[in-house]
């Protein structure tokens, strides 16, 4: 893997340490030849989610097109999910518009639907 | 496939109740926001009322508020409409639609409800 | 409660023509506005969500522009399958409102 990234199983991992909207950590995850990651297992989810820590960090599965896509076009019906409890919800109650449409770990590493503006860290992913 | 069914419509009379269905199929039910939408013969698209994933927030629209009663069972993959104290005015094809801030798709097909004496 | 409008409320076209409908909000709906088409007998069809996004396999002569309070739906060359009625509805904050429709029909 290149420096500063994490290699598990076929994929290499970059935890990022400040914040950044969806749109742009996905953006910056390009630049790097990579994607926002994309949670294939439990494992994964478990690897993830020891490198990241407590901490709310946006993943690469968004419904910003209408239903919930990952980035790199892995189905999302037929794969992994770890959502919390109760979500997503595409709570309303935030008064900026609209509902929530980007996924992120959340702080016990269940995924949770937020405000796709909102600066939360990020993980990049890109194949070994 | 994505797909809705709606089913349960009918003639009743003025005061009366009925339940609409919505079967859906092909998405994963419990990720999405699910709606009623109506159209009375000849008029316009009406918002009805919504429903979260979860059930945890719902809405209605100020006409039927008090009288209407959405719910789901994301075991079942089904969205329902209790429809009380109907009047004439709620006469219309009712459809259901998956979706939010987004737009609504797709839609089913629609069930006509009649209120009548 | 956000009322939305639309201008006209019917048109007349022929095929080949430039079609613009035009929605307007009662107040700012930032880019949350959706359009729709219904033809007779069936279930709405979802074109452009937020204002300006092309529903996946809806052809490109369709195409949606406007922020804030002021929305249009282009279709650059009508077909004869566009023949139907329009519908915006704004998906910024419940309740949520549609239209009152703009009616397409041939020339």
């Known amino acids: 893997c290149p420096v500063n990234w994490v290699g598990y199983e076929g994929s290499c991992y970059w935890f990022s340490r400040s914040g950044k909207p969806w749109p742009e950590a996905e953006k910056y995850c390009q630049l790097e030849n990579a994607h926002l990651v994309v949670v294939g297992s439990w494992e994964e989810q478990k690897f993830i989610q020891h490198h990241v820590g407590p901490v709310n960090s946006w993943i690469g599965l968004t419904d910003q097109s209408g239903p919930w896509k990952w980035v790199d076009g892995t189905d999302y019906e037929s794969g992994f999910k770890n959502w919390r409890p109760e979500q997503p919800d595409d709570w309303y109650g935030h008064g900026l518009g609209g509902g929530e449409d980007c996924a992120h770990f959340t702080e016990d590493g269940g995924w949770n639907d937020d405000i796709c503006q909102r600066p939360y860290r990020w993980v990049c992913e890109t194949q070994r | 496939e994505v797909q809705l069914v709606e089913s349960g419509g009918g003639l009743v009379k003025p005061g009366g109740s009925l339940r609409l269905s919505c079967a859906a199929s092909g998405f994963t039910f419990s990720s999405y926001s699910m709606n009623w939408v109506r159209q009375a013969p000849g008029k316009g698209l009406e918002w009805v009322s919504s429903?979260?994933?979860?059930?945890?927030?719902?809405y209605y629209a100020d006409s039927v508020k008090g009288r209407f009663t959405i719910s789901r069972d994301n075991a079942k993959n089904s969205l329902y409409l209790q429809m009380n104290s109907l009047r004439a005015e709620d006469t219309a094809v009712y459809f259901c639609a998956r979706g939010g801030s987004r737009g609504f798709d797709p839609w089913g097909q629609g069930t006509l409800v009649t209120v009548s004496s | 409660d956000i009322q939305m409008t639309q201008s006209p409320s019917s048109l007349s076209a022929s095929v080949g023509d430039r079609v613009t409908i035009t929605c307007r909000a009662s107040q700012s709906i930032t880019s949350y506005l959706n359009w729709y088409q219904q033809k007779p007998g069936k279930a709405p069809k979802l074109l452009i969500y937020?204002?300006?996004s092309l529903q996946s396999g809806v052809p490109s002569r369709f195409s949606g522009s406007g922020s804030g309070t002021d929305f249009t739906l282009t279709i650059s060359s009508l077909q004869p399958e566009d023949f139907a009625t329009y519908y915006c509805?704004?998906?910024?904050?419940?309740?949520?409102?549609f239209g009152p429709g703009t009616k397409v029909d041939i020339k």
């Open positions: 429903i979260s994933g979860s059930s945890s927030y719902i």
């Open positions: 937020t204002a300006s």
């Open positions: 509805q704004q998906s910024h904050s419940f309740p949520f409102t």
